[in-house]
């Protein structure tokens, strides 16, 4: 659903002192496009609540209207609550706007839960922890919604940063990064670490903690360690990629990997949870399940309802297993795999039991649509998305939460055949970009 | 079918041990499917849950007393054991033990109970 | 930590008047939620779980209902055996941990 699982987040604090760093494996300067090195002053530029969502602050109109915008790589329009609404502190005023222009269209944007439906215009948008730059953008004008906004998050609006193809009503709205990248001399490249907490978070550090960075224009070194795997851009409409192997600690699921991409397989920002096709889901359970059976934790549990508490600090890490997605390499028969560890795919959730206990939900889910690489992967990693290359890339996060016995990893070459018969290839109809409920 | 059958004195000294055992019989402690908990009641209040335990030995227990309890297994005898330290009159109750069913979720049998006064 | 608010603390009925009780979770527990009862000298019995599902060999009178933060056992026509006091608990938090305060139930 667009609610909880659909929007995600965990806000996060910042990394690992720089002593805890891994040391550089190589220097991939060469290969990189765009601005390299070190981009200041778009580091930790995202904030974030558990579940909530990472948002960065943008402005829209002139004279400048500041509001707090979720980051999603899961859709393509840029929309922006422009109404009052009961969870919104501020909105967008159009009326106040001299640079405001009307496109006399409307939108209507459903979910499987909720809907929110508004006004097309276009108006100069800027990013102040971002480029230097303002763009003429077409923005979505959010007047009516349900369960859309979420109370206490802190955000507006919607930064739909995925292609043309997704976009509403139809893929003539060209998406703002389009319309950024066409305007401005900036690489067509931008690159999130979304950094999760760890531990629950109460109201006041929930609120003053960073979330993480979207560099924009390049790759910052300093956001991750190791080297960068990039995997292909199967098509450009979501980030859609292609896992050819999943393993629980280090053992095969040995499913056709056909499963593992049906009927797509993204990387979505805008989702909290690692979310697997039925069978995936529940292959992968089972196994999980199997690897840590020395306790037994309640149905509702695996199903991401239930909560499981510990006493502050001794949550059994060392029980659970990781998990390992093997994605495509660039160089045919060769994959590399994106290891995370149940820090990541145990989410921390506030407020619930004592301040004597950890409580944490289960963040991996079943989906209908396909694979879902949300906030549980992108927190273990730094994620490029090349968009000039039609590829993305993947690096340890220097901000992932891990302990003194494992690491998450990105690790590789292995050889793998036949991967492309891992795509699926789904049915082409009128409807079929309709489903955006992503439930 | 299962019961389950709470035993142990009746009576503690402030400052010891108080002891229980729960005997399970009609059924197996090592199913999968189970933990197995104790609750107390203080006479004319309500319940309060002590801790639980699964067979292989892994157990929670209530923040506010854990520094004094300990709850362990023995699969072999097919029971479970209660010790909490340092007791003063408060925890003077009736002590229950009980299964975890119901996706581990629900105290779905219990123990009939035993009364354990503190007092010297 | 959740908190679990029971009421009435008391409720005076005859038998063959139906009975309402409420349950009050300080946060949501979604639909993790057990009734159970408890009659003098007597351990608790398990009545209801998952908010609306009847444990085995529980009557059809006894029925749950609600979800998140407010929950209701109705007892539909009181039997004279069903005079007692009647808690709620809680597991959307695990493990099991939380009961509510109780509710007596007793004959006018």
């Known amino acids: 659903t667009h609610l909880g699982i659909r929007l995600p987040l965990r806000s996060g604090l910042a990394g690992p002192p720089l002593g805890l760093r891994l040391p550089r494996e190589t220097d991939e300067e060469s290969e990189e496009p765009g601005r390299r090195g070190s981009f200041v002053e778009m580091v930790d530029n995202l904030r974030g609540k558990s579940g909530q969502g990472y948002y960065v602050e943008m402005t829209v109109g002139s004279p400048p209207q500041t509001l707090n915008i979720l980051v999603d790589t899961g859709s393509s329009n840029f929309a922006v609550g422009a109404a009052p609404h009961p969870f919104l502190h501020r909105y967008y005023q159009r009326q106040l706007s001299s640079t405001y222009r009307d496109l006399r269209k409307g939108v209507y944007v459903p979910y499987t839960q909720g809907k929110w439906e508004g006004e097309l215009g276009t108006d100069l948008v800027s990013i102040p922890h971002g480029p230097n730059v303002t763009v003429r953008a077409n923005i979505a004008a959010i007047t009516e919604s349900d369960k859309f906004f979420i109370n206490g998050s802190n955000w507006e609006g919607i930064l739909g940063l995925a292609y043309a193809e997704i976009a509403r009503p139809d893929d003539s709205l060209e998406p703002f990064f389009d319309s950024l990248v066409k305007q401005t001399h900036i690489p067509n490249i931008f690159s999130l670490q979304l950094c999760g907490a760890g531990f629950p978070l109460n109201q006041t550090e929930a609120l003053a903690s960073v979330g993480g960075s979207m560099i924009i224009g390049g790759i910052d070194h300093s956001l991750y360690t190791g080297r960068l795997w990039y995997t292909p851009i199967r098509r450009e409409w979501y980030y859609e990629v292609i896992i050819v192997r999943v393993e629980i600690n280090g053992q095969d699921l040995k499913m056709d990997c056909k499963e593992y991409n049906y009927d797509k397989s993204i990387v979505d920002s805008g989702t909290t949870n690692l979310r697997l096709p039925k069978k995936v889901f529940e292959a992968a359970v089972k196994s999980i399940k199997a690897a840590s059976s020395t306790e037994k934790f309640p149905d509702g549990f695996w199903l991401g309802e239930q909560l499981v508490c510990w006493q502050a600090g001794t949550t059994p890490w060392n029980i659970f297993p990781v998990i390992s997605l093997y994605l495509m390499g660039e160089v045919t028969n060769q994959s590399f795999r994106i290891t995370i560890l149940p820090q990541q795919y145990l989410r921390p959730v506030e407020d619930v039991a004592t301040s004597q206990d950890d409580c944490y939900k289960f963040a991996v889910s079943q989906s209908s649509t396909g694979t879902v690489m949300g906030a549980v992967i992108m927190e273990g990693f730094y994620v490029v998305f090349d968009r000039a290359r039609k590829r993305i890339g993947f690096a340890v996060s220097a901000c992932h939460v891990h302990d003194e016995f494992r690491t998450a990893a990105v690790e590789g070459p292995f050889v793998t055949a036949d991967m492309e018969d891992c795509g699926y290839n789904i049915p082409q109809t009128d409807e079929s970009t309709l489903m955006t409920g992503r439930a | 079918q299962l019961q389950l059958q709470e035993s142990g004195p009746g009576l503690v000294k402030p400052s010891e041990t108080l002891s229980l055992t729960c005997t399970v019989s009609?059924?197996?402690?090592?199913?999968?499917?189970?933990?197995w908990g104790w609750i107390r009641q203080p006479p004319g209040k309500g319940l309060e849950w002590i801790g639980s335990?699964?067979?292989?030995?892994?157990?929670y227990y209530n923040p506010s007393l854990k520094s004094r309890v300990t709850i362990s297994v023995d699969t072999s005898k097919n029971q479970f054991s209660l010790k909490l330290s340092s007791v003063t009159a408060a925890d003077t109750a009736v002590y229950y033990c009980?299964?975890?069913?119901?996706?581990?979720?629900?105290?779905?049998?219990w123990g009939r109970g035993t009364l354990v006064t503190v007092s010297s | 930590e959740i908190v679990l608010t029971q009421s009435p603390a008391t409720l005076s009925l005859s038998p063959g008047e139906r009975a309402t009780l409420s349950c009050r979770a300080s946060?949501?527990?979604?639909?993790?939620l057990a009734w159970y009862q408890q009659k003098p000298g007597q351990a608790p019995r398990l009545l209801i779980y998952?908010?609306?599902n009847r444990a085995t060999g529980i009557p059809a009178r006894f029925s749950g209902s609600g979800s998140g933060t407010d929950f209701t056992l109705t007892i539909s026509s009181l039997e004279p055996e069903d005079f007692a006091v009647y808690y709620c608990?809680?597991?959307?938090?695990?493990?099991?941990?939380?009961f509510g305060g109780g509710t007596k139930v007793e004959i006018k």
């Open positions: 608990q809680q597991a959307y938090v695990w493990p099991p941990r939380t």
């Open positions: 335990i699964y067979y292989s030995g892994s157990t």
């Open positions: 946060q949501s527990v979604s639909s993790y």
């Open positions: 009609g059924g197996s402690i090592s199913s999968s499917s189970y933990y």
């Open positions: 998952d908010a609306s």
């Open positions: 009980a299964r975890v069913g119901h996706g581990i979720s629900y105290f779905d049998l």
